[in-house]
């Protein structure tokens, strides 16, 4: 799925308006990414509990297990993002898969992801049938990681 | 930084050409995202070795430590992506931070990230000063996670 761009539209003050209203399917087809998180969403109960499974997706087998929460904005590309939510404060023991080990912390790994917002073009609200894509950095938690607690010097 | 889009350019067969060649700085300013990985790149030696540090960024404190490898494509948005490369096959012990524990595997977490490629518009190579942004899913490894080995049923 591709979007045709006028060369220079990123900086020239003028671009020609289009002749018709864009059907919603077109924008959403272009803006919607894979609507799945890095790991398939697990609908089994253990994906929401503080334990490390011996099967299933990575987020439920991790000793720092997490669930995924949807973040949806139809005016953003990609429209769906997923945030990792840690299910335990500490890491789960590799031996038992259930008891927490206070020697390890389960912490989210954050990332500033590049996203684009559909916006009215600056200074021409309502005057033209065109829009701008605004590049932004958007903070998402990608996963939860088992780390050794930080020792302050 | 925003890019002006003609409404309808995502699906209409024609869009007006611009009157001038876009300066390279404009595309790069728009396409370049934050050129940093989720965690600051560590230039100390331990970030490249199989051990869990007690300080430094998350990827070096993790018991499934990883390093970041740059993937740069000037015709892609974002132009810089980072791939996580696991530094250990097994998880590092929480007690020692150095010895590996065979009960846990250190595995990459993969994600199909939305990216955009600058392409000549279909069927009009060289005829107009415009280009298309093609949305693609691109596989990146986000981090390395300590998991319990999968038990096959």
């Amino acid at each position: 799925v591709s979007l045709r761009i006028q060369e220079g539209c990123s900086h020239l003050p003028s671009c020609c308006p289009s002749k018709e209203q864009e059907p919603p399917e077109e924008w959403l087809k272009w803006s919607s990414a894979s609507v799945s998180p890095p790991e398939p969403l697990s609908h089994t109960h253990h994906a929401e509990s503080c334990r490390a499974s011996k099967d299933g997706p990575l987020n439920s087998r991790a000793i720092s297990p997490w669930s995924y929460e949807l973040d949806r904005d139809l005016n953003r590309v990609p429209q769906d993002l997923y945030h990792a939510r840690c299910l335990c404060p500490h890491c789960v023991s590799l031996q038992t898969g259930s008891h927490m080990d206070p020697l390890g912390n389960s912490v989210p790994l954050y990332h500033n992801q590049t996203v684009f917002y559909r916006r009215p073009c600056h200074g021409e609200e309502g005057t033209h049938r065109r829009y701008c894509l605004e590049r932004r950095l958007y903070r998402v938690s990608l996963a939860c990681v088992c780390v050794r607690p930080r020792v302050m010097a | 930084v925003s890019l002006r889009i003609q409404e309808g350019c995502s699906h209409l067969p024609s869009c007006c050409p611009s009157k001038e060649q876009e300066p390279p700085e404009e595309w790069l300013k728009w396409s370049s995202a934050s050129v940093s990985p989720p965690e600051p790149l560590s230039h100390t030696h331990h970030a490249e070795s199989c051990r869990a540090s007690k300080d430094g960024p998350l990827n070096s404190r993790a018991i499934s430590p990883w390093s970041y490898e740059l993937d740069r494509d000037l015709n892609r948005v974002p132009q810089d992506l980072y791939h996580a490369r696991c530094l250990c096959p097994h998880c590092v012990s929480l007690q020692t931070g150095s010895h590996m524990d065979p009960l846990g595997n250190s595995v990459p977490l993969y994600h199909n990230q939305t990216v955009f490629y600058r392409r000549p518009c279909h069927g009009e190579e060289g005829t107009h000063r415009r280009y298309c942004l093609e949305r693609r899913l691109y596989r990146v490894s986000l981090a390395c996670v300590c998991v319990r080995p999968r038990v096959m049923a």
Epitope: Q21, P24, W27, E69, L70, R72, D73, R76, P120, Y131 | -
Partner: antibody
Framework: QVTLRESGPALLKPTQTLTLTCTFS??????????LGWIRQPPGKALEWLAH???????HYKPALKSRLTISKDTSKNQVVLTITNVDPVDTATYYC?????????????????WGQGTLVTVSS | EIVLTQSPATLSASPGERVTISCSAS?????MYWYQQKPGQAPRPLIY???NLASGVPARFSGSGSGTDYTLTISSMEPEDFATYYC???????????FGQGTKLEIK
């Protein structure tokens, strides 16, 4: 012309399950970007959003009520159903269904552009 | 969860008067939406995306604001404008719609 109509029981007893149906016409819930939500308003109080369902069957719920709410759609019947389990007198309210999905040149609006007339539900022992 | 606080809760005004209703968000948001509700009726959209008038809404209504502070203004009150007004926002994570507690506009 877009219309929405809510239907459901006027009176329930505490602990019962409330099932509300929104029947709509003039648009399709299978159209990309379209969504339908439920909002309630206790007598003399403010509007409170409860749940939302999108064209692609993605569902959202008010976090504080999530465990009690279920929203579903039947696109062929042009209906959306909301169930609320274990009702209490504080659930007494006028329940509205409303549409969201207006695309402008600048993008989608997250306002509810069409509303039903509402149905009053009383929970009392 | 973002909280919307409207002020004042009640406002008395006379026909012809200029009226301003405020809506404050507990954290920064991109856009605000406004509705009018009359007794026994469903809410009616007034303002889309902070400042765009909904279809059929008279030009005496306007919206403005950014960040955490948003305003609905009625430049010259008409008798039919006496009603309750609500601000509303959409938050993408977690996806939720939130309404303000309402401002009741009464005849002085």
């Amino acid at each position: 012309q877009v219309t929405l109509r809510e239907s459901g029981p006027a009176l329930l007893k505490p602990t019962q399950t409330l099932t509300l149906t929104c029947t709509f016409s003039g648009f399709s819930l299978s159209t990309s970007g379209m969504g339908l939500g439920w909002i309630r308003q206790p007598p003399g109080k403010a509007l409170e959003w409860l749940a939302h369902i999108w064209w692609d069957d993605v569902k959202h719920y008010k976090p504080a009520l999530k465990s009690r709410l279920t929203i579903s759609k039947d696109t062929s019947k042009n209906q959306v159903v909301l169930t609320i389990t274990n009702v209490d007198p504080v659930d007494t309210a006028t329940y509205y269904c409303a549409r969201m999905g207006q695309l402008h040149y600048y993008g989608y609006d997250y306002a509810m552009d069409y509303w039903g007339q509402g149905t009053l539900v009383t929970v009392s022992s | 969860e973002i909280v919307l606080t409207q002020s004042p809760a009640t406002l008395s005004a006379s026909p012809g008067e200029r009226v301003t209703i405020s809506c404050s968000a507990s954290s920064s948001v991109s856009y605000m939406y406004w509705y009018q509700q009359k007794p026994g009726q469903a809410p009616r959209p007034l303002i889309y995306r902070t400042s765009n008038l909904a279809s059929g809404v008279p030009a005496r209504f306007s919206g403005s604001g950014s960040g955490t502070d948003y305003t609905l203004t009625i430049s010259s009150m008409e008798p039919e404008d006496f009603a309750t007004y609500y601000c509303q926002l959409y938050h993408s994570y977690p996806p939720t719609w939130t309404f303000g507690q309402g401002t009741k506009l009464e005849i002085k």
